[in-house]
């Protein structure tokens, strides 16, 4: 009996048209739903002239429905039993499940000024920049509305600069109609434990954006991982969120829905510093921000996004050192609402429900030649919003899953 | 003091790509944009476009949109300039030009890399 | 593309004399930030150009106080008070406020 249902997983959870697992894997049949709170800065005018710590409090959530469009230009290639596509990104706002409106203003860092500075490090260029970010009234801390944070606006320091540069600034700009990948991932048909794992991004097998095995692409999307999955795994994915491959571990059994799945959590070793996690040596990119690679918990990914500085870490720095948090006020970190899970159902590898949670930082440092910098006595990595993404399987789909699957099992 | 290093010229096929170095010296490379000029024989000057090598970002004429891929190696301070689908017209001196800090000037040159396409 | 139109082409002058160059572009050259991008360039036979002028009247570091940058909008002339045997070459005035940038077609200043 055991082998006969071994042999149905088998079948059905490669990626290839007919098996139950393609259908989900082109188009997720599961609502998935991204909810950002932002740092609405309180102190603004303290921050800049007096390098006070800057006070911040959450609001939200705002919450869009993303992960609603079809995988495009899926192609299977039979030689080397892979599978490639590209996946389109897309967000729809949901007033019913928001606090306010896309129209919201929240008083935030100036992303271009923070990104320009640190970018052009020259000190004759900064004294040009300075100019412009004058004469365009532009300050160290703007006010901007929901639409215009998270998806783009036109800056007006930046349409002053004489160079052809993007004068459109955004956290997620630009997505609508843009796509991530291409993804190349192995469809299982030649060896089921591979299913789903990626084997190429972007048409490389590394990312050139770290040293050594950090810049490798491991593991899957976290959307499903090969089947039977074991308690003692530790589940290897990549997150182009976050510009790296990361790795969750088993946490507790859950019932969802009746369906019994395995909790994978990431554990905070993943965000610990090289003092005690020697692993992540190479996710420390430079020595002054991060204290000679003693500080944890915030990842810069500014190489993967043109030198902007970006930081990423969990919401409310949970897992990071009290050094980076300590300039900042009125943050309340706790696991339960700010880490990230997968719930996965063993027998299948599927992933039925997750939490994905992430927060957008930051740095803004010093600047002799930036009026609006000069103050500042210290370096802050500004935390600028946090999202929650989540999906669970519905409970039409967990009723067939239940007979299909487990049903069949138990 | 600041110097700009160009390669060797080029004699070459229509159709065929080149990649012409400008190695630089003398200043910190990845802190000022690193433009590439054309003259055509006897003739003025053309913008091509242009790289910052602190992150690689680029600016174009669109005019040499597809003709040319502007890229830099960091370690080596060397910014290199690569022309594709060579014709006769892509004949001319190429300049690679420092710029002079973000006032769209160019204060240093390179000696220039003679290209002649020719079957 | 912003054009730019140098004149004369050719400037034939004595040694010690005054020369003039004009440079005139198809629309302002004032840049929304409140600039002017127009620089001049001198390339002698076989060499690379070397800035002279930036920014309409800016001298770029070791030129001669006999050359003189002015001019605004659409109209800029470069002056040399004396001219002397090593500023013989081309010149050409360039345009940084509208991207593609561009450069005029150059005045060849020679000796009469």
């Known amino acids: 009996g055991d082998l006969l249902i071994q042999k149905t997983i088998k079948k059905q959870v490669v990626l290839e048209e007919g098996t139950i697992a393609f259908k989900n894997w082109v188009k997720t049949g599961t609502e998935v739903y991204r909810q950002f709170w932002i740092f609405d800065v309180q102190n603004p005018q303290e921050v800049m002239m007096n390098s006070s710590n800057i006070q911040v409090k959450q609001r939200g959530p705002y919450t869009y429905r993303v992960r609603f469009l079809a995988k495009e230009n899926v192609t299977q290639d039979a030689e080397d039993n892979t599978v490639s596509f590209l996946q389109p990104n897309g967000a729809i706002f949901e007033p019913s499940l928001s606090v306010g409106t896309e129209a919201d203003n929240f008083t935030v860092l100036n992303l271009a000024v923070a990104a320009a500075s640190h970018i052009y490090q020259n000190q004759f260029v900064q004294m040009i920049l300075n100019s412009l970010i004058n004469k365009s009234k532009s300050s160290m801390f703007q006010v901007r509305t929901l639409r215009e944070l998270l998806w783009g606006y036109r800056d007006p320091f930046l349409s002053l600069v004489p160079y052809p540069v993007t004068t459109t600034v955004g956290l997620f700009y630009p997505y609508n109609n843009t796509a991530d990948g291409v993804y190349k991932v192995f469809n299982g048909k030649d060896n089921i434990s591979k299913v789903a794992i990626i084997d190429t991004y972007k048409g490389k097998r590394n990312l050139s954006y770290w040293e050594s095995h950090c810049d490798m692409i491991n593991g899957t999307d976290a959307a499903s991982f090969p089947p039977f999955v074991e308690k003692s795994q530790v589940l290897q994915f990549f997150s182009s969120d976050i510009c790296r491959s990361i790795y969750a571990v088993f946490e507790s059994d859950v019932n969802l829905k009746g369906i019994p799945v395995y909790r994978f959590v990431l554990p905070s070793k993943a965000f610990a510093s090289p003092v005690e996690n020697p692993d992540n040596y190479c996710f420390c990119t430079e020595k002054i921000i991060s204290k000679n690679c003693t500080s944890y918990g915030v990842l810069d990914i500014s190489k993967c996004k043109e030198g902007r500085p970006v930081y990423i870490s969990l919401p409310h720095f949970l897992y990071a050192s009290p050094d980076v948090s300590e300039p900042i006020d009125g943050l309340n970190p706790n696991e339960e609402e700010h880490r990230t899970y997968l719930d996965i159902e063993p027998i299948t590898g599927f992933t039925l429900q997750f939490a994905k949670r992430l927060q957008v930082n930051l740095l803004v440092k010093p600047s002799e030649k930036i009026q609006v910098l000069k103050n500042l006595k210290r370096n802050y990595i500004v935390p600028i919003l946090w999202l929650n993404e989540t999906g669970t399987i519905g409970d039409e789909k967990a009723n067939m899953f239940r007979s299909q699957v487990t049903g069949k099992i138990n | 003091d600041v110097q700009l290093q160009e390669s060797g010229p080029e004699l070459v096929k229509p159709g065929a790509s080149v990649k012409i170095s400008c190695k630089a010296s003398g200043y910190t490379f990845t802190d000022y944009n690193m433009h590439w000029v054309k003259q055509s024989h006897g003739k003025s000057l053309e913008w091509i476009g242009y790289?910052?090598?602190?992150?690689?970002?680029?600016g174009y004429n669109q005019k040499f949109k597809s003709k040319a891929t502007l890229t830099v190696d960091n370690s080596s301070s060397t910014a290199y300039m690569e022309l594709r689908s060579l014709t006769s017209e892509d004949s001319a001196v190429y300049y690679c030009?420092?710029?002079?800090?973000?006032?769209?000037?160019?204060?240093?040159w390179g000696q220039g890399t003679t290209l002649t396409v020719s079957s | 593309d912003v054009v730019m139109t140098q004149t004369p082409l050719s400037l034939p002058v004595s040694l010690g004399d005054q020369a003039s160059i004009s440079c005139r572009s198809s629309q302002s050259l004032v840049h929304s930030n409140g600039n002017t991008y127009l620089h001049w360039y001198l390339q002698k036979p076989g060499q690379s150009p070397k800035l002279l002028i930036y920014?309409?009247?800016n001298r770029f570091s070791g030129v001669p106080d006999r050359f003189s940058g002015s001019g605004s909008g659409t109209d800029f002339t470069l002056k040399i008070s004396r001219v002397e045997a090593e500023d013989l070459g081309v010149y050409y005035c360039f345009q940084g406020s509208h991207v593609p940038w561009t450069f005029g077609g150059g005045t060849k200043l020679e000796i009469k």
């Open positions: 790289i910052y090598p602190y992150n690689g970002g680029t």
């Open positions: 920014k309409v009247s």
């Open positions: 030009a420092r710029d002079g800090g973000y006032d769209v000037y160019f204060d240093y």
